[in-house]
């Protein structure tokens, strides 16, 4: 018996060939001997089967002794043994129809689970072999689960259903809803304007939800909500904002926040959460602010940074075009009785300068000038 695999929703063509290369009488029946279709001369006749409106043949092939059964918009329950009766012969074809679907929405939040469910006919024992957009293979039976979805899992998943050494292939498009970056860090000199951007890693027609930025300042004992906002069809509207600092927010995507001034008391880390309509869970992006201040008080030139710096970052003070006078893996460095000239305070990571602040030290009878 010939086995043919079909895909739910697709069209399948079951072949039946006579030895005579001419149009002769044929009938297609199901396993219950109910007639599906056949011919009367050059006319197509249909029986009382459930396939009635979805069954067809190719009259153009009859003259060549080919009498196919075409079944459109396949359903799992179309799985059956189909019998072609022609020239006193019976040709049996077993049709197995499979469906593979994501059991929830195909738009999933980062960190959520994807479950692919295989619909299969009774008595079949298929295996499913799926490949993610980044090339990772996963195997399963009736269900196949992937936990902790990552951004790279967005895209087309390709799956092969195997049954009796035959296969049917599926593609499922998955969108992982996430921010482009899980975390970002902004380095600013005291007094500079700060721009925070939260670009999304996906595009959808309509985007509705609400969000909030919580901030944990280094100097503060607890975190506080800096801003809450709504998102309606990609338009941003601010609901509530603190008075200190007075944040401003862009009205369009990507989500964009402006802090008028970088001050030591704002240095710290924040967590922007975005709850999307009809989705359980939230999107998160961490943002960090590091603020630098260079000052001269009497005979002491000091450079300080506030905010989340890693232990490997180097803070140094140097007179322009000279070797660093002081360089430490600490958050404050100073020079006593600094020479006159333009001093540079540098925050660097493996030689790469992240933040720089200049301060002019005048001869001792003057007061310092900060450019």
């Amino acid at each position: 018996k010939k086995v043919v695999l079909g895909k739910k929703g697709d069209t399948v063509e079951l072949t039946c060939t006579a030895s005579q290369k001419k149009s002769i009488q044929f009938h297609w029946k199901n396993s219950n001997q109910i007639k599906i279709l056949g011919n009367q001369g050059s006319f197509l006749t249909k029986g009382p089967s459930k396939l009635n409106d979805r069954a067809d043949s190719r009259r153009s092939l009859w003259d060549q002794g080919n009498f196919p059964l075409i079944i459109k918009n396949l359903k799992i329950e179309d799985s059956d043994t189909y019998i072609c009766e022609v020239e006193d012969q019976k040709e049996e074809v077993q049709l197995l129809v499979f469906g593979l679907t994501a059991n929830s929405d195909t738009h999933l939040l980062q960190g959520q689970s994807l479950t692919l469910t295989l619909e299969s006919p009774p008595g079949s024992s298929p295996s499913v072999q799926c490949r993610s957009p980044r090339g990772k293979n996963i195997q399963g039976g009736k269900t196949l689960s992937v936990s902790q979805l990552e951004l790279q899992d967005s895209g087309t998943w390709t799956c092969t259903v195997l049954q009796n050494q035959k296969k049917v292939e599926f593609k499922i498009d998955i969108v992982v809803l996430a921010f482009q970056k899980a975390s970002s860090i902004v380095y600013k000199k005291e007094g500079e304007q700060v721009e925070f951007s939260f670009p999304l890693a996906f595009t959808v027609e309509k985007l509705t939800g609400s969000g909030e930025l919580w901030w944990q300042a280094e100097r503060a004992s607890s975190s506080k909500s800096w801003i809450t906002f709504d998102l309606k069809n990609k338009e941003v509207s601010v609901k509530r904002v603190t008075q200190d600092p007075k944040l401003q927010m862009g009205k369009k995507l990507p989500l964009h926040l402006t802090l008028p001034q970088a001050l030591p008391q704002y240095a710290g880390s924040g967590n922007l959460t975005l709850a999307l309509e009809a989705k359980t869970g939230k999107l998160h992006q961490e943002v960090n602010l590091v603020v630098m201040r260079a000052t001269q008080l009497q005979k002491n030139l000091t450079c300080e940074v506030w905010g989340p710096t890693s232990p490997k970052l180097m803070l140094s003070l140097k007179l322009e075009n000279k070797e660093a006078k002081v360089s430490k893996r600490e958050k404050a460095v100073w020079v006593l009785n600094p020479e006159a000239g333009m001093w540079q305070c540098l925050l660097s990571d493996s030689g790469q300068v992240l933040l720089e602040s200049n301060i002019k030290v005048l001869p001792t009878w003057s007061t310092p000038v900060q450019p």
Partner: antibody
């Protein structure tokens, strides 16, 4: 019987683009996964990338910026382009089929030697 | 990248011998381990896929086993045509190959 046949120039100049085509008979490239693998003389095998039945591609991360795989379903062919080649890209290049998605290459072309030299 | 280490790199054996080649992965590859045979000047031939499934047309003297990070190819009784280089290859993620095991006549 499934057959794969690589074709393309055997000599490519450094910094140029290596272009190879794999012609498939006995199977359709709109089913399964179609791969490129190479083997430098006297060395082991290295996976370059694949194109799937769904026209999705994936490349070896170490070569990603230089590799492109595409297909022409009307000719039942798929192609490899490797840009900015150096002498280190001299190898026998194979195309191969992975029918069921296990990255198990069950049919291979006979391979074509590409030499990178000025 | 998942690294595969084959051992031994080469071995000498006689016709009729039982031979075992091992392949160790740098991380769990979930049984996605394939074995190939290659003869000089020829393309590799698939022997075993998904740890233990024999590819069609491959003699039953070839078998595969293993799980997690450790996998084995066994040839139960060496035939003259089996002298070749054998490669393991993981298919859990984008493929990587072992460095090969050259099987020579003693």
């Amino acid at each position: 019987q499934v057959q794969l046949q690589e074709s393309g120039p055997g000599l490519v100049k450094p910094s140029e683009t290596l272009s190879l085509t794999c012609t498939v008979s006995g199977d359709s490239i709109t089913s399964g996964y179609w791969n490129w693998i190479r083997q430098p003389p006297g060395k082991g095998l290295e996976f370059l990338g694949y194109i799937s039945f769904a026209d999705t591609t994936n490349y070896n991360p170490s070569l990603k910026s230089r590799v492109t795989i595409s297909r022409d379903t009307s000719k039942n062919q798929f192609s490899l382009k490797l840009s900015s080649v150096t002498a280190a890209d001299t190898a026998v290049y194979y195309c191969a089929r992975d029918d069921y998605g296990y990255y198990a290459m069950d049919y291979w072309g006979q391979g074509t030697l590409v030499t990178v030299s000025s | 990248d998942i690294q595969l280490t084959q051992s031994p790199s080469s071995l000498s054996a006689s016709v009729g011998d039982r031979v075992t080649i091992t392949c160790r992965a740098s991380q769990d590859i979930d049984n996605y381990l394939n074995w190939y045979q290659q003869k000089p000047g020829k393309a590799p031939k698939l022997l075993i896929y998904y740890t233990s499934r024999l590819h069609s047309g491959v003699p039953s003297r070839f078998s595969g086993s293993g799980s997690g990070t450790d996998y084995t190819l066994t040839i139960s009784s060496l035939q003259p045509e089996d002298f070749a280089t054998y490669y393991c290859q993981q298919g859990n993620t984008l493929p990587t190959f072992g460095q090969g095991t050259k099987l020579e006549i003693k």
